[in-house]
């Protein structure tokens, strides 16, 4: 009786179970009663990443330099090429099909996480006691100067964008 289901790494064709082609190979001809499945290796710049019955291999992804893309990991017969973005740019999606500039954190915000080729700068607001007076893609919020440790007093309060201003203590006491 012809099978209705096949084992793992097999497929059903013409009422019989044939072996799937291994990753990196494509199907040339199905098996018969007398012959095994015929598979051929993928060509240069092609791949198949699963056990398959595909008659054509997939083209490796092209990392278009005009879009700011470059090869992070070269593809093999079993894996696709992985693209990333040039320095100072990051991917707009997980598929990394185009790149955008890293953003800077505005004054009042500090860098929580520096950008990479695949993720943008993550900014955070400077909490009370901290400030950032620059637009930067790597500077964290800085703590306000401690006037007391310098034997000075606060003459002007700090904000999230400015440091405190220290001054000499008033020596005249009642």
């Amino acid at each position: 009786e012809p099978p209705t289901a096949c084992r793992e790494k097999q497929y059903l064709i013409n009422s019989q179970c044939c072996s799937l082609c291994q990753p990196g190979q494509k199907l040339v001809s199905d098996c018969t009663e007398f012959t095994e499945t015929e598979c051929l290796p993928c060509g240069e710049s092609e791949f198949l990443d699963t056990w398959n019955r595909e008659t054509h291999c997939h083209q490796h992804k092209y990392c278009d330099p005009n879009l700011g893309l470059r090869v992070q990991q070269k593809g093999t017969s079993e894996t696709d090429t992985i693209c990333t973005c040039e320095e100072g740019w990051h991917c707009t999606s997980e598929a990394c099909e185009s790149c955008v500039l890293h953003r800077s954190c505005s004054p009042g915000f500090g860098v929580k996480q520096i950008a990479t080729g695949v993720s943008d700068t993550i900014c955070e607001p400077c909490p009370v006691g901290f400030f950032s007076n620059v637009s930067s893609a790597f500077e964290k919020c800085h703590p306000w100067t401690s006037c007391e440790t310098k034997d000075l007093v606060v003459q002007q309060a700090g904000t999230n964008k400015t440091d405190v201003v220290c001054g000499p203590q008033d020596r005249l006491r009642a």
Partner: antibody, heavy 115, light 112 residues
Framework: EVQLVESGGGLIQPGGSLRLSCAVS????????VSWVRQAPGKGLEWVGI???????AYASWVKGRFTISRDNSKNTLYLQMNSLRAEDTAVYYC?????????WGQGTLVTVSS | DIVMTQSPSTLSASVGDRVTITCQAS??????LSWYQQKPGKAPKLLIY???DLASGVPSRFSGSGSGTEFTLTISSLQPDDFATYYC??????????????FGGGTKVEIK
């Protein structure tokens, strides 16, 4: 055909403002980054600034807020707004496509700043 | 800001000559170096990117080399169409959110 076409140049008085346009065809501004590059008469090339596919911008350090790059995706057009113009801003202004290099250029538009 | 020093500023050569133009960056730019050709009244045309990659449609007599701070453009056998001005261009990201695209001063290749 893939191309960039600049327009909006002309004679302008010092201190004046001017907006240049760069109409692109054959590709989308929501996919590619485009820069403005200028060239003073008989001089070399100088980068002005860039707008990325998401609308983010970066400028040359000398720009100091005088110039602003923007775009209108529906018109597939890029703009360079130039304020407080000086004689030394006299140049041919090109738009050029690319991220770390410029593989496609427009023909340029001449801006003359003179009284 | 990064400074690109290109030399020579003018070069006299004959058809068939091997021509070399150099560009020096004031700090390391890895391989972020491009070369352009410009003819009078025309826009620049990309020849080489990433220091040594030949742009599409550019004849193989043009080649680029170098990394870090020293770069070279070579024309193996100068053709009549190659008399023009050549510019190098660096890309540099400071890591602080500032971007720099700096051009060299140009090299005019003229007929000897």
């Amino acid at each position: 055909e893939v191309q960039l076409v600049e327009s909006g140049g002309g004679l302008i008085q010092p201190g004046g403002s001017l907006r240049l346009s760069c109409a692109v065809s054959g590709f989308s501004l929501s996919t590619y980054a485009v820069s403005w590059v200028r060239q003073a008469p008989g001089k070399g090339l100088e980068w002005v600034g860039i707008i990325d596919s998401g609308g983010g911008t970066a400028y040359a350090s000398w720009v100091k807020g005088r110039f602003t790059i923007s775009r209108d995706n529906s018109k597939n057009t890029l703009y360079l707004q130039m304020n407080s113009l000086r004689a030394e801003d006299t140049a041919v202004y090109y738009c050029a496509r690319g991220v770390t290099f410029f593989g496609l250029w427009g023909q340029g538009t001449l801006v003359t700043v003179s009284s | 800001d990064i400074v690109m020093t290109q030399s020579p500023s003018t070069l006299s050569a004959s058809v068939g000559d091997r021509v070399t133009i150099t560009c020096q960056a004031s700090q390391s730019i890895s391989n972020y170096l491009s070369w352009y050709q410009q003819k009078p009244g025309k826009a620049p045309k990309l020849l080489i990117y990433r220091a040594s990659d030949l742009a599409s449609g550019v004849p193989s007599r043009f080649s680029g080399s170098g990394s870090g701070t020293e770069f070279t453009l070579t024309i193996s056998s100068l053709q009549p169409d190659d008399f023009a001005t050549y510019y190098c261009q660096a890309y540099y990201y400071s890591g602080g959110g500032s971007y720099d695209y700096a051009f060299g001063g140009g090299t005019k290749v003229e007929i000897k």
